[in-house]
């Protein structure tokens, strides 16, 4: 698993809707794979973390002034939808095929 | 200034091209305002940090399992270009009006 010492990468994060209080309106699934972006954005930033120019600059400044400026952060750069069955305003179970932005597709340094 | 206890916001970051070794090809300006995204992504995530659904979910999971899952991260969500004078392959000073992705326009929680 990706710890503080490992480089920025996508790791598993199973989310149970009951744990976050969303089971009141999401009927199914009970849980889903959200993924999480974990790990550091270390110099030199590799191509696979698709760094922006600003992230590259910030990484270089952090290298010179580590107490003044933070490293770039490992975050989702592309998200995917999931399908959910939920209750509408009338309480009718309805399927939303593409509930956008719920699962990490790609991680990167920003 | 935005510290660990303050909420996610854009703060000043003056970058000197000599400090990061880019003065070998960027002639001018000598420095520029890159800005930095600093501060925490605390529950509840405010609208001004434009959270994605995944960031909201991760924040809720972190609230329940703080040791297992990290908070969302405060990162640039919109970048702006700067203008730079550089030397081309023939050594001719050339102005690039829009050197993209160099300065933070907006920060958010991701």
């Amino acid at each position: 698993s990706a710890g503080a010492g490992s480089h920025c990468q996508k790791t598993s994060l199973r989310v149970n809707f009951e744990d976050i209080g969303w089971d009141s309106w999401i009927i199914a699934p009970k849980e889903y794979e959200a993924y999480e972006c974990k790990g550091g954005c270390f110099f030199p930033l590799a191509d696979d973390v698709t760094p922006t120019k600003h992230a590259i600059v910030q990484t270089l400044v952090h290298l010179k002034f580590p107490t003044k400026v933070g490293k770039a952060c490992c975050v989702p750069t592309k998200l995917s939808p999931i399908s959910v069955l939920y209750k509408d305003d009338m309480g009718v179970p309805t399927l939303k095929y593409h509930y956008e932005g719920m699962s990490v597709a790609e991680c990167g340094c920003r | 200034s935005a510290g660990a206890g303050s909420h996610c916001q854009k703060t000043s970051l003056r970058v000197n091209f000599e400090d990061i070794g880019w003065d070998s090809w960027i002639i001018a300006p000598k420095e520029y305002e890159a800005y930095e995204c600093k501060g925490g992504c605390f529950f509840p995530l405010a609208d001004d940090v434009t959270p994605t659904k995944h960031a909201i979910v991760q924040t809720l999971v972190h609230l329940k399992f703080p040791t297992k899952v990290g908070k969302a991260c405060c990162v640039p969500t919109k970048l702006s270009p700067i203008s730079v004078l550089y030397k081309d392959d023939m050594g001719v000073p050339t102005l690039k009006y829009h050197y993209e992705g160099m300065s933070v326009a907006e920060c958010g929680c991701r």
């Epitope: - | 081309d88 050339t94 102005l95």
Partner: antibody, heavy 119, light 111 residues
Framework: EVQLVESGGGLVQPGGSLRLSCAAS????????MNWVRQAPGKGLEWVAH??????????HYAESVRGRFTISRDDSKNSLYLQMNSLKTEDTAVYYC??????????WGQGTLVTVSS | DIVMTQSPDSLAVSLGERATINCRAS??????????MNWFQQKPGQPPKLLIY???NQGSGVPDRFSGSGSGTDFTLTISPLQAEDVAVYFC?????????FGQGTKLEIK
């Protein structure tokens, strides 16, 4: 070695026409803005016109003193720059320099060609 | 148009001494943190040659005795120590906006 060689100068009567040419070598001609800069005898330098790149649709700009009378053009396939000068006036008498460079500076200069407008 | 005014029109300086030429723009020629100011040297019978660009950067092959400074509207070209081959006319030029304009020139001679 960068070289710009102007030709086409000479003596012409007021109201007449002349076409200057500039042959470029030693650099990728199509990558650079090209200009004409002139210098009246014993006087200072005056930018006349420039032409940008193909990616800029070969946009042109002219000094107010020549607008409507002079036309700058380029042929990237021949590494050549041109200046068509019509309705010439005595005050157009000058050495005309072909210069190449960027959107920031005149980097390369030719030796110049003398245009004399006199009756 | 941006008007460039040089001073003095001419000057005579002894070999080994410092020569200073000033250039004032009618409005600021700075933008984006960049000075759009260049200096050219023209020797008799020759085309101009780029000496200094962006106010303070030496052109290719330009000796270290040539330096430039300034920002906004006021700029200076300094030659030190002066050598015999530096006899020439010097022009400042702005490229902030079209039409790109030159100063009237400063003739440098040996005293």
């Amino acid at each position: 070695e960068v070289q710009l060689v102007e030709s086409g100068g000479g003596l012409v009567q007021p109201g007449g026409s002349l076409r200057l040419s500039c042959a470029a070598s030693g650099f990728t001609f199509s990558n650079y803005w090209m200009n004409w800069v002139r210098q009246a005898p014993g006087k200072g330098l005056e930018w006349v016109a420039h032409i940008r790149l193909k990616s800029d649709n070969y946009a042109t700009h002219y000094a107010e003193s020549v607008r409507g009378r002079f036309t700058i053009s380029r042929d990237d396939s021949k590494n050549s720059l041109y200046l068509q000068m019509n309705s010439l006036k005595t005050e157009d008498t000058a050495v005309y320099y072909c210069t190449g460079g960027s959107n920031y500076v005149f980097a390369f200069w030719g030796q110049g060609t003398l245009v004399t407008v006199s009756s | 148009d941006i008007v460039m005014t040089q001073s003095p029109d001419s000057l005579a300086v002894s070999l080994g001494e410092r020569a200073t030429i000033n250039c004032r723009a009618s409005e600021s020629v700075d933008n984006y943190g960049i000075s759009f100011m260049n200096w050219f040297q023209q020797k008799p019978g020759q085309p101009p040659k780029l000496l200094i660009y962006a106010a303070s950067n030496q052109g290719s092959g330009v000796p270290d005795r040539f330096s430039g400074s300034g920002s906004g509207t006021d700029f200076t070209l300094t030659i030190s120590p002066l050598q015999a081959e530096d006899v020439a006319v010097y022009f400042c030029q702005q490229s902030k906006e079209v039409p790109w304009t030159f100063g009237q020139g400063t003739k440098l001679e040996i005293k």
